[in-house]
Interface confidence: low
């Protein structure tokens, strides 16, 4: 299953499959997730080690048992790959690292006014993988405001150095934010020239393209089909690059197929997994396990559940079957691709779905009325769980926010439905940033069921929580995916990085905003909050947030939206925007429904008809 916990001051011993430099543990974990053999990782922050060569070291590890012995190492951070973690699987990494220079091949230098602009340039350059920016206070005047675009053979820095007044980060192409655009066409009987960066075996050009998309240096590819004239080159997928970023030439060639990486696609990237099953095909590789199962789909499920399994072959040979079950060969290789592909067999083959982000785990698991005042514009994909609840009567307007917590579930405030409990007047927009982008053609979700907390009363502020079941499940993308729920009764975690988002008013007597706003707000103790609201009862099922001096808050139109906090690299839904005295007033914090206190209710209501929970929360 999916394991998300991090181990502080711990280092996994042995099992190394790769090492690299990464700026933090989260990026190291992402590299582990996308590495075909990595199950565990250990990261050494600069503060944890004196050996300059090992600072920022990210060590990717494999283990036959799925675990390795942990040794104590002050400052080290270890954890698990996020394979099998559904919507948490993403190659997108937005963080900017201050005081850090990520080294690589500097291929472009320009003067820019901010680190954000530098990151945008990197994202809009086909070859840029990461960047460094020298701020206006950099010690050498001639380098100030320099934006260095970089790449490296492995897509990660060749070294990372602590350096004052330098800021570094990664391209946001994996966040589907590139302005370059992509070419989705597949070119039959056409071979591209230029430099081969890798060679793998794939059953078709589409798997080849997905591998190219997630390979750090692949910009385009050529695939040789299974009827290619040279037998040893059949099913070869050549991952390619060039100085210019595009093929310098193409040659008409029977039984070849070429195309481009889809990493520069805007707003949508292919999933990093291959779900198709190939009948009459055998995939060769190292044997992991052999099991008898009923049907090729069960074989694929078995492979997906066994975390080390990369691909499988389901044999229909009479000697491999007994009764209704046949042998399911679970296999793996060094690069995650078959070492041999044979056609015309009595088998069916396919890949593990461990990297698909539409897995069953609708919400992450761990084992062990009111708009933003004083906020700033959000960017695409920054808050992918945020939804807009709109009402269509004669005209259509935004009324409330909400949070996507599963394929078919949205969590919001009960008071959003005061006077409007009709399912069919509501339209739920997900994966949007600008309300003005909504047209009559913009897809929206309709409500199947509104579940208002049984103890909620319009006249009181208590139990201000409601669940919406959507008529149809939503697919997850970089711009539309759920937020993790907290643990039941989560009281021990100290959240220091909390944000409220919404399209609500920017001042008490304002109007709905076009661009989704965000504001960083500190949590306030319930005792402190009660002092500020002596006419109301602040219960343990509420959480408060705000600045003593005011100026930043949620406001009308933000109701039902999320209060999220980042802890150990993971965002959690801590509160639901509920009420407050005015907006952003001095010593009048915003009051939010405390989600952790309602975990039993949420899990009970989201149980499917067969009794299986639609979502799980950290236990």
């Amino acid at each position: 299953g999916c394991l998300t916990q991090l181990y502080e001051n711990a280092f996994f011993r042995g099992g190394d499959v790769a090492s690299m430099y990464t700026p933090n543990a989260q990026y190291c974990q992402m590299r582990c997730t996308f590495h075909p053999r990595c199950l565990l990782f250990s990261f050494l922050p600069a503060s944890s080690i004196n050996d300059m060569e090992k600072r920022f070291g990210c060590f990717l590890k494999d283990s036959v048992t799925g675990t390795l012995p942990k040794v104590h190492r002050t400052g080290a951070v270890s954890g698990h790959s996020l394979k099998q973690c559904g919507h948490q699987i993403s190659a997108c990494h937005r963080d900017i690292y201050k005081g850090v220079d990520m080294r690589g091949v500097n291929f472009n230098v320009s003067k820019v006014s901010s680190v954000e602009e530098c990151q945008k340039r990197c994202t809009s350059n086909i070859r840029c993988q990461f960047f460094s920016y020298a701020t206006q206070t950099f010690h050498k005047a001639e380098y100030r405001n320099n934006c260095l675009l970089k790449y490296s053979p492995g897509g990660t820095p060749t070294a990372i150095k602590v350096l004052s007044n330098v800021e570094s980060g990664f391209s946001l192409k994996p966040c589907a934010l590139s302005e370059i655009g992509c070419h989705m066409n597949i070119f039959q009987h056409l071979a591209f020239s230029d430099v081969d960066v890798a060679r793998v075996l794939t059953p078709d050009a589409f798997v080849c393209r997905t591998i190219c998309t997630y390979h750090p240096n692949c910009l385009f590819f050529t695939f040789y089909t299974n009827v290619w004239k040279i037998e040893s080159q059949r099913n070869v997928c050549l991952l390619k690059t060039s100085e210019s970023g595009t093929p310098s030439s193409s040659t008409p060639q029977e039984n070849t197929i070429s195309g481009y990486s889809l990493l520069t696609c805007k707003r949508t990237l292919p999933e990093p997994c291959h779900s198709k099953i190939y009948p009459g095909v055998d995939f060769g590789g190292e044997e992991l396990n052999v099991t008898f199962v009923k049907g090729v789909n069960v074989c694929q499920e078995t492979c997906t559940k066994m975390i080390r399994c990369q691909f499988f072959t389901y044999s229909l040979l009479p000697e491999d079957c007994k009764e209704e079950k046949c042998k399911c060969f679970l296999r793996l290789s060094m690069d995650g691709s078959p070492t041999r592909i044979a056609y015309g067999t009595q088998g069916s083959s396919g890949y593990s779905l461990r990297l698909c982000n539409t897995g069953d785990n609708s919400v992450c698991t761990t084992k062990t009325s009111t708009r933003i005042v004083g906020g700033t514009n959000s960017s695409w994909g920054e808050w992918p769980w945020q939804v807009s609840l709109q009402v269509k009567l004669t005209a259509q307007r935004h009324l409330c926010g909400g949070s996507l917590i599963g394929h078919q579930w949205v969590l919001t405030a009960a008071h959003c439905f005061d006077g409007l409990p009709l399912q069919d007047v509501w339209r739920i927009y997900s994966g949007i940033l600008n309300l003005s982008d909504i047209t009559k053609d913009t897809p929206f979700s309709q409500i199947k069921e509104i579940i208002i907390h049984q103890n909620y009363k319009v006249s009181e502020g208590n139990h201000d929580i409601a669940l919406i079941k959507l008529q149809a499940p939503l697919n997850y993308t970089e711009f539309q995916k759920p937020i993790c729920l907290p643990s039941k009764g989560d009281t021990s975690t100290i959240y220091t990085n909390c944000w409220v988002t919404g399209w609500g008013f920017s001042k008490e007597k304002g109007e709905i905003q076009n661009i989704l706003q965000k504001v960083n707000i500190p949590l306030v103790t319930n005792e402190e909050c009660q002092k500020r609201y002596q006419d109301y009862k602040i219960t343990q099922r509420m959480v408060c947030a705000g600045y003593k001096e005011g100026g930043k808050d949620a406001c009308k139109g933000d109701s039902g939206g999320p209060l999220v906090c980042k802890h150990n690299g993971m965002w959690r839904l801590v509160g639901i925007t509920s009420w407050g005295e005015g907006c952003a007033r001095r010593e009048q914090p915003g009051v939010y429904t405390k989600v952790a206190e309602y975990m039993d209710w949420i899990l009970e209501k989201t149980q499917s008809s067969d009794g299986k929970a639609q979502m799980q929360s950290p236990a």
């Epitope: 370059i180 070419h183 066409n185 210019s244």
Partner: antibody, heavy 118, light 107 residues
């Protein structure tokens, strides 16, 4: 306003040459695949050539080796150099942008007439 | 190359009629099919892309359907400005190809 404006058409003798230009405005030209589509008098549309945002070019078999497509992103201009012209190249030549999802020609110029005749 | 066959090549209809134009491809193209309208003396304009998605500003009387190899453009309640030639185009495989066109004339 998004716009494409062709120029350079005219009357030319068989075997002669012409260079068509297409000036783009209202969008970030360098991001888009651009192409030429032609229409012979009273006939349907025929794709001629296009150039991807990265510079890779492709041509219809009927013009391969005779026509060259190019672009100057700094000038927001697309070109079609037509050599060894034949009578069957007589047509209205449209400049078009490949922009919609799944590669529709979403923006078209008004067209420029090329007549090849002795 | 993928061959595109449009039918009929021309048709006569009256204002208010519903008109259906079909486009058949020589191999499966999933939903990579676009429809264009060309009025006399004008450049073509895209009506529908990806089989059934209406280009913004195109009236809702135009609709597209189909998948694989058989596709349809339907014009419900024909208006005077709809008398034009309609082309289908595939963008599934290089080279992209157009149908030969269907001319919709006034009865």
């Amino acid at each position: 306003e998004v716009q494409l404006l062709e120029s350079g058409g005219g009357l030319v003798q068989p075997g002669g040459s012409l260079r068509l230009s297409c000036a783009a405005s209202g969008f970030t030209f360098s991001w888009y695949t651009m192409g030429w589509v032609r229409q012979a008098p009273g006939k349907g549309l025929e794709w001629v050539s296009w150039i991807y945002f990265g510079g890779l070019t492709t041509y219809a078999d009927s013009v391969k080796g005779r026509f060259t497509i190019s672009r100057d992103n700094s000038k927001n201009t697309l070109y079609l150099q037509m050599n060894s012209l034949r009578a069957e190249d007589t047509a209205v030549y449209y400049c078009a942008r490949l922009g919609g999802p799944l590669d529709a020609f979403d923006i078209w110029g008004q067209g420029t007439m090329v007549t090849v005749s002795s | 190359d993928i061959q595109m066959t449009q039918s009929p090549s021309s048709l006569s209809a009256s204002v208010g009629d519903t008109v259906t134009i079909t486009c058949r491809t020589s191999q499966t193209i999933n939903n990579y099919l676009n429809w264009y309208q060309q009025r006399p003396g004008e450049a073509p304009k895209v009506l529908i892309y990806a089989t059934h998605t209406l280009e913004s500003g195109v009236p809702s009387r135009f609709s597209g359907s189909g998948s694989g190899t058989d596709f349809t453009l339907t014009i419900g309640s024909l208006q005077p400005e709809d008398f034009a030639t309609y082309y289908c185009q595939q963008s599934f495989a290089f080279p992209y190809t157009f149908g030969q066109g269907t001319k919709v004339e006034i009865t």
